[in-house]
Structure formats: C-alpha cells, structure tokens
C-alpha cells in the first residue's frame, strides 16, 4: 500500500498530551525508531511520568482514506464486554504549511490526532519544493512553533552590513519566487531557502534538510545546506551553509529582523530574536484573553463580543463580512454554521460561507502584534477551510464606545484579513517570564 502523504514520510513527528505528560512519536509511512515500542510501531506513546513506552499504532495495521489515517494494534483495551484493540486515528485537514500533528483526545481505546497540512490539500497550490518540520518540544514538553513565520511567497531580508550582497531567507521551506516575483528574488534558484543576491545574480546558499532543533531553553536552530555538488567560486572551496538561531527574548518586545552575526567562506550564521521562538502558551490563548504570570501581559478582548444578535459589518467590495468575535452568538446570515466570521456575496445573498468558526479561535500576541484567528470555516476548492485573521491595533480614541470596528483589508488563498483599531487592544505589560 502506497504511503498516503509522501511529503510527511521523511520525518518522525511529535505530539504531546500535556494533561497526562505524554509524548507521542508518529511516523506515518514507516515505523518510529524506538526499541521499547517494538519494530513496527507507527505511533509510540512515551509516558514521561512512568518512563514507559507503549505502541498505540502499528505500521503494518494501517488503513487510509484521503483525510483519515488509522493505525490499529493487537493490544486489547479493557472496554467491558468488547474485543476492541488500541488504535490511533489521525484526521488530516488542508493547511498552508506541513504543519504539526496535534493531540486532540484519547479514550480507553483510541488516541485521536488532527493535522492541518499541505499534504492533505486537494490542489498543490501550497506545496513547497522542500519543507521541513518547523516546531519542536522542549524538555518540559512545551511547544515552540515557527510555522507562523513561514512565508508562502517572498522572503526575509537578513540585516547585513555588506552593501554588495543581500541575503534572503525563508523559514523551514524554500523561497517561492513564482507567487511573489519580487525583482531581487526572481533570479533565486528553485529550492533555495537561503538566497544570496549579488548584483543581478542570485545563488543558492542553503536548502532545508533537517527539521527545527532546540539547542537549549528558548534557543532554536535551523540549518540549511547547499545540496547539489559544485562549489560556488566565491566560497574558497567550501560548501555554503546557513545556520539560523531563533532566540526567545527575556521579556516582551517588538519584533526584530534576522541579523547576520558571522560570515566566513559562505558559512552564514544568523540570529533572529523573536517571540515565536518562545513556547506557544506564552504567545497564545484559546480564549479572548491573555493574562497571568505565564504571558507577561494583560489583554482582554471579551468586551468586543456583540450581544442580541447584532454583528460587526465589514465591507469587502464583492462581499460583506459579518463578524461576531469572542462569543458564541450565531450570526443571523450564517445561521447554524457556528461562524465567528460570515462572508455573504452582495450580488447573491444566498451565497453564504463561514470564514472561521467561533470554537476554532486563537488569540496570539507575538513580536508586538495582537492577532485573533478564526479557522475551520467552509472549504474552498483547494480543500483549505476558510479562515480569518484579525490584526488589532491599540487606539484609545476608537469610536463605537472604544470598541472600534473591523476593516476588511484583503484575501489570500481563502484567508481573509482584517484590521481593527480598538482601545481593548491596548496591552498592559508585566515583566519577565
């Protein structure tokens, strides 16, 4: 049986059940290389409390559809009066990066995961030439996830004192020059994740090979190497390589750009101080507030919730968008869709799409940007579920009793972007995490 998601095959992936202090290792095409789980385990559960290992999915007992992968085992689970076996179930959804498997829940018999990934899309529009896992768990099982930094088009310009060259990088995947052919990037070779531009020429100085690594608490490292043979004439016989170290700052701060810290014989060392390198619980909340010791800030957007069936309305030329954030009030136009953002076509109001659901909510504060994300909306033709990204700005003189109002700014591949000036986005900082 052919591997259902070949892009995901090259790596052993990790997911965590924080509630029970359990680390899962997942290899969807072969077996995980953990002796204690046996030679054919595809899903290996490491109980960190008891320091024991249990196979909860066997690679030989795999069954697959386009959106679901199940691994059975021969291990009985003691559900009274049944002969059920322990199994793992991975539901796949279309995403814009390789993404990460997320532990959802577990019953006596089944361990459930969900994975939003380019590998599950109906079309190849989000697929990279080369992409590597872009997250890592530290020794305390806290997740550090750089997926939000991945550019689907274009690249980051590295801060470098050399006026004759420009070094462009992407995070965890190659630079897509076709979707956003900026003049300088146009000459970059396909597959490069680190592109050195000198005058009108561009050179591949690194491609992603291994996934993100954690070197010590709050320092993550990504290494790129030039795959093909053939040295560049300005590298003094050395093969080019790029090392990017992502550093979680010691306290809250605005974002910075990546900086070149060392360069020798085409070996480039880059340091990037960014809060995306911090653990995810420091940056994100599933509710509309971020507060407490862990986050160093106090943010509460719950006063933006609308009651009594009214919604915020944002004009998007062809469409009207109805928004109801930080609550579970049904939007009238989007009845029964559990939408937080509802897209209605002006010329045909029967064409209604959920552009993100209220129970699929993430509030993120990172590098000085406050963002509310609603995902899991109605599918587009690519298989990607519509989502909305609302970027908040602090405005102490916002109208509408300080609440302000959302403004639609554009759409890219079924992701809808809004800005929202409001006094409730004014962040109160604590100090040190």
């Amino acid at each position: 049986q052919a591997a259902p998601f070949p892009e995901l095959c090259s790596y052993t992936w990790e997911a965590v059940d924080t509630k029970n202090n359990v680390l899962y290792k997942i290899n969807i095409c072969g077996s995980v290389d953990i002796v204690q789980c046996g030679p054919s385990s595809a899903v290996c559960m490491h109980d960190l409390d008891t320091r024991t290992y249990h196979s909860v999915g066997d690679s030989v007992l795999r069954s697959a559809t386009r959106s679901l992968l199940e691994f059975n085992t021969t291990v009985s689970c003691d559900q009274q009066g049944t002969n059920h076996r322990v199994q793992s179930s991975i539901a796949f959804l279309c995403g814009k990066t390789l993404g990460t498997p997320e532990f959802v829940t577990a019953t006596e018999c089944v361990h459930y995961f969900e994975w939003r990934t380019t590998a599950a899309c109906k079309k190849d529009i989000f697929k990279a030439n080369k992409e590597v896992p872009c997250y890592v768990f530290d020794e305390e099982l806290r997740k550090h996830d750089l997926n939000p930094l991945i550019k689907l088009s274009g690249a980051y310009l590295v801060d470098d004192s050399d006026p004759d060259t420009s070094l462009f990088i992407n995070v965890c995947r190659d630079i897509d020059t076709l979707r956003d052919p900026g003049s300088q990037l146009r000459a970059c070779p396909p597959g490069t994740a680190a592109c050195l531009v000198r005058g009108h020429q561009a050179f591949d100085v690194g491609q992603p090979r291994d996934g993100l690594k954690v070197v010590r608490k709050d320092r993550l490292v990504l290494s790129y190497v030039r795959e093909e043979a053939g040295k560049l004439d300005f590298c003094d016989g050395h093969s080019p390589a790029v090392t990017i170290t992502f550093v979680c700052p010691s306290e809250r701060r605005e974002g910075t750009i990546p900086k070149l810290t060392a360069k020798s014989n085409c070996r480039y060392e880059i340091e990037w101080i960014t809060e995306y390198a911090c653990h995810r619980d420091y940056l994100e909340s599933k509710t509309c507030s971020l507060s407490g010791e862990q986050q160093d800030v106090s943010i509460d957007l719950t006063p933006l919730a609308q009651s009594g069936g009214s919604s915020y309305i944002s004009d998007g030329k062809e469409y009207l968008f109805y928004l109801n954030v930080c609550g579970e009030t049904e939007i009238q136009f989007c009845n029964k869709k559990q939408a937080a953002v509802c897209q209605v076509k002006k010329s045909d109001t029967s064409q209604v799409k959920a552009a993100g659901r209220y129970h699929n909510q993430t509030l993120r504060y990172s590098d000085g940007d406050l963002t509310l994300i609603y995902f899991g909306g109605d599918e587009c033709s690519s298989g990607f579920q519509r989502m909305s990204v609302i970027n908040f700005e602090c405005n102490k003189t916002a109208g509408n009793d300080g609440k302000g109002t959302p403004v639609f700014t554009g759409e890219v591949d079924c992701t809808y972007f809004f800005t929202w000036d409001t006094e409730y986005a004014c962040v109160h900082h604590h100090h040190h995490h």
Partner: nanobody
C-alpha cells in the same frame, strides 16, 4: 485540603483477589491522571498502573492481565482490582494524582501481603 486516602489492603493467599480504593478530596478528580505505585520491603517504589484523565489505561508488564485500574468520578475514587495475586505482589500500594496545574499528590499507602 487536597488529599488521597487508600484503603482495601490486607492479607490474602496466593491466587486470591483484593480491590484497593483511593478516595480523593479537594481536587477536580476527573481532570487528573491517576496512577498506582507500590513499594516492596527493601526495594524502590515501582509503577503499577495508570488511568489517564481521558480514560486510557496502561499497566506494568508484571501485572498485565491480572490487575485492572478503574475510576468512579461521582465518588472521586480510583480502584485497583488485583486478581491472581502472587507473593511478589506484597508491597505498600500508593495512589498518585497529577495534572498540569497541580503538584503530584500522593496517598499514605495501604499494605498488601500475599502469603499462605
């Protein structure tokens, strides 16, 4: 006050059965992972069984097929049903509760002696 109290230990003949109970107070019981451990005289404490907050169960190889862990959320109690007991099962049995928001909580233990 948060505490766990074990009961049900005692003297039993080889091949016999016992059911240990561990009653919890002061915690949201259903949110917690529950474990049973045991410590035989002169030996280190060893893990016996786990009942995760989601419901999955795992057992040490030495007790697999003989012991069953279960819980009653209404009574805030976790049980360890021990069948086909052997002399090497003789130990003090402890229950432990853990969750991301709590430090581990241990009971005071209950003695199980398997002897003819």
């Amino acid at each position: 006050d948060v505490q766990l109290v074990e009961s049900g230990g005692g003297l039993v003949q080889p091949g016999g059965s016992l059911r240990l109970s561990c009653a919890a107070s002061g915690i949201i019981f259903s949110d917690n992972r529950m474990d049973w451990y045991r410590q035989a005289p002169g030996k280190q404490r060893e893990w016996v069984a786990t009942l995760a907050s989601y419901g999955w169960k795992t057992y040490a190889d030495s007790v697999k097929g003989r012991f069953t862990i279960s819980r009653d959320n209404a009574k805030n109690t976790v049980y360890l049903q021990m069948n086909s007991l052997r002399p090497e099962d003789t130990a003090v049995y402890y229950c432990k509760a853990s969750s991301p928001v709590l430090n581990d909580i241990w009971g005071q233990g209950t003695l199980v002696t398997v002897s003819s």
